[in-house]
């Protein structure tokens, strides 16, 4: 049984979400990793992914999303810059391990973006400056498409920070939809 947990991040429009996904095991260091959004009753949609194999400290950018994999720490750093209200939602990191299902990394991120002056932090504990400098060299990676059978996962409850759902077997869905966003110049 897997206990699904999530953390809530409340930020203002224009700010940057800066989170880390802990993949723990060294064997996953070079595995391709992805950042997904989970919409109620739908399969997770992949927004961005690292290269395959995933390179150490090598930024990958898809639109406003930047992924950096730090093998020395077992962490995937995810940044979403210039946040918009419509970015609000539930996100997760996964590790691609074909032909098996993607391996989910805890915790899921419940992002709430509100309108307002972006210079005012949404929270003094979990927000970052709204000005963000894009890394000079970034790569756009192609995310894989899976074609094996899939099931729609039940969307977890909309909840506050650090709330756990009851222990239950989860069926991680395969990825079919890739959201493409223009890459910054």
């Amino acid at each position: 049984a897997t206990k699904l947990t999530e953390e809530k991040y409340e930020l203002k429009e224009g700010q940057t979400l800066d989170v880390k996904c802990d993949y723990t095991l060294e064997k996953f260091a070079s595995s391709q990793k992805a950042w997904q959004i989970i919409r109620d009753g739908e399969m997770p949609k992949t927004l961005a992914c690292t290269e395959r194999p995933s390179k150490n400290s090598h930024p990958v950018q898809v639109g406003r999303i930047i992924l950096e994999d730090y093998h020395d720490h077992g962490l995937l750093r995810v940044r979403m810059v210039n946040l918009q209200v419509e970015d609000s939602g539930l996100y997760q990191c996964v590790i691609y391990q074909p032909p098996k299902e993607p391996h989910m990394l805890f915790d899921r991120i419940r992002l709430v973006v509100t309108k307002g002056f972006s210079g005012t932090p949404g929270s003094n504990e979990n927000s970052t400056q709204n000005v963000y400098k894009i890394p000079p060299t970034t790569t756009k990676a192609l995310c894989p498409l899976y074609t094996s059978p899939r099931t729609v996962t039940q969307a977890p409850p909309k909840s506050t920070a650090d709330v756990s759902t009851p222990d239950s077997e989860i069926n991680l869905t395969n990825v079919t939809d890739i959201i493409r966003v223009p890459v910054f110049n």
């Epitope: 989170v19 730090y70 720490h73 391996h103 805890f106 927000s127």
Partner: antibody, heavy 117, light 111 residues
Framework: EVQLVESGGALVKPGGSLRLSCAAS????????IHWVRQAPGKGLEWIGR????????KYAPKVQGRFTISADTSKNTAYLQMNSLKTEDTAVYYC??????????WGQGTLVTVSS | EIVLTQSPATLSLSPGERATLSCRAS??????????LNWYQQKPGQAPRLLIY???YQGRGIPARFSGSGSGTDFTLTISSLEPEDFAVYYC?????????FGQGTKLEIK
Amino acid sequence: EVQLVESGGALVKPGGSLRLSCAASGFNIGNTYIHWVRQAPGKGLEWIGRIDPAGGRTKYAPKVQGRFTISADTSKNTAYLQMNSLKTEDTAVYYCTGHYGGTMDYWGQGTLVTVSS
Amino acid sequence: EIVLTQSPATLSLSPGERATLSCRASQSVSNYGISFLNWYQQKPGQAPRLLIYAAEYQGRGIPARFSGSGSGTDFTLTISSLEPEDFAVYYCQQSSNVPYTFGQGTKLEIK
């Protein structure tokens, strides 16, 4: 080479405050988590809390929540532990650590905090 | 919070012998297919050193004689053949739930 160096340990009176520093070299603290752990003389290890220096998000052990504050300055590649309302039972060697394997690794040498009147 | 109980409190062995240290958690520390149970070694006057992470994976630069096993609530650290430098205090620690917690330690001493 990865290195963490703690400083700021001192003798302080009960009720007093102290700020410890953890200077990192060989890696960027913004790309990892920094944890603080302490060890009272002759006792075991106790996790205090951690920070994601890039996002500023913190987690604490209930025992120190409200009295201790972890912060970080990524431009200085340094993390901090602000300790207020100190008690004699806070006497310990304080370690900062990096993160690896889902837990704490890359330990500093520790700095001694003595709370006594 | 999750309570970790280590046994024995003290283990007296000779170099070359096999050491088996146990750690029991008050609730499961396994999630997402991973057991978040780690082992540290600490010698007097030194900082702890990560030996085993995620129950069974060796930390960087750790000799092959150190191995870990277990899942759920019961875990074991095994040192296949003790070297003189292995005599120290060993702590188990869980990183499954905040607050992270440590066991009380097992002192491995020379017989």
